[in-house]
Interface confidence: medium
Amino acid sequence: APISSHCRLDKSNFQQPYITNRTFMLAKEASLADNNTDVRLIGEKLFHGVSMSERCYLMKQVLNFTLEEVLFPQSDRFQPYMQEVVPFLARLSNRLSTCHIEGDDLHIQRNVQKLKDTVKKLGESGEIKAIGELDLLFMSLRNACI
């Protein structure tokens, strides 16, 4: 299996009750506006064929996409949560900037691309869905990167 380097986040990032709550509240607000409950972005299909030792790298890719293609364009919505959560997630992204995989990551990129394609295909409702799954993104980062 490919070797992942520097794919670690300190536990303290996930031990801040206030920002944890704000992240989950943002997800809740967005999920209330999500009518497409049959589609799941962060779930079994995303993780398929990706070992846990590669999972943090996978979630880094999802985090970066979510920030750049979803949260920044939608930054005026779901206030006041968005203005607090986006900088927090951006800090996590920055801390994972040196996380990479030595070797073939095609299987990971393929899974991430499917997530990206789904969001793009759904348009704005895809972006809302991605925000509604920030709780899953948060939990997956915690599960994989500590």
Epitope: F24, F47, I146
Partner: antibody, heavy 121, light 110 residues
């Protein structure tokens, strides 16, 4: 076939200790978060503790925090629960449970048959 | 004690539909889509029948369906059958990284 086999239960006096083990087979153990769930005789299910794939995060129910310690040995495909300062209310059947898919340990899709812990003087 | 509230018993005739409620708080069921449902026959181990509010594991009958509204999750069993007589438990993941269960509901097929 996924198999989870618990062991280590028994009768212990209040204040005593026990160490439960769960031997896992039939899947890539270090791809999954794991949990301990207990069920007192004739009662409902109570989550006790959970651990992520590499032991980096360990979470506990308030009722056992500071007394119980969850750990895992991926080389041995084993999950453990060290139980100290045991109380009568800890008497239960203790289940080892695995997540349904590896990204979410809280969806407990596979369960062992349990090991019985009795705390009595 | 159980953190999520379920009715202690629900009954129905064969072929009917029944719904079991699971009421929590804004910190668990209300906030996140991490609700699971388990079936437990007497003397047997629990079986996951619904996860992430409304997803069914492979092999679970499509007669079982899950939903959620505000702080209450629901499990519906349609076309009730004799083998559905069992205890049912809901659970939810929380933002404090713990799992909470309901007290369980005994389903009786009349």
């Amino acid at each position: 076939e996924v198999q989870l086999v618990e062991s280590g239960g028994g009768v212990v006096r209040p204040g005593g200790s026990l160490r439960l083990s769960c031997a896992a087979s039939g899947f890539t153990f270090d791809d999954y978060g794991m949990n301990w769930v207990r069920q007192a005789p004739g009662k409902g299910l109570e989550w006790v503790s959970g651990v992520n794939w590499n032991g980096g995060t360990r979470d506990y129910a308030a009722s056992v925090k500071g007394r119980f310690t969850i750990s895992r040995d991926n080389a041995k495909n084993s999950l453990y629960l060290q139980m100290n300062s045991l109380r009568a209310e800890d008497t239960a059947l203790y289940y080892c449970a695995r997540g349904w898919y590896s990204g979410a340990a809280w969806n407990m899709g596979y369960w062992g048959r349990g090991t019985l812990v009795t705390v009595s003087s | 004690q159980a953190v999520l509230t379920q009715p202690s018993s629900v009954s129905g005739s064969p072929g009917q539909s029944i719904t079991i409620s699971c009421t929590g708080a804004s910190g668990d069921v209300g906030a996140y889509n991490f609700v699971s449902w388990y079936q437990q026959h007497p003397g047997k181990t629990p079986k996951l029948i619904i996860y992430d509010v409304n997803k069914r594991p492979s092999g679970v009958s499509n007669r079982f369906s899950g939903s959620k509204s505000s702080n209450t999750a629901s499990l519906t069993i349609s076309g009730l059958q004799a083998e559905d007589e069992s205890d049912y438990y809901c659970s939810s993941y929380t933002s404090t990284f713990s799992v909470v269960f309901g007290g369980g509901t005994k389903v009786t097929v009349l």
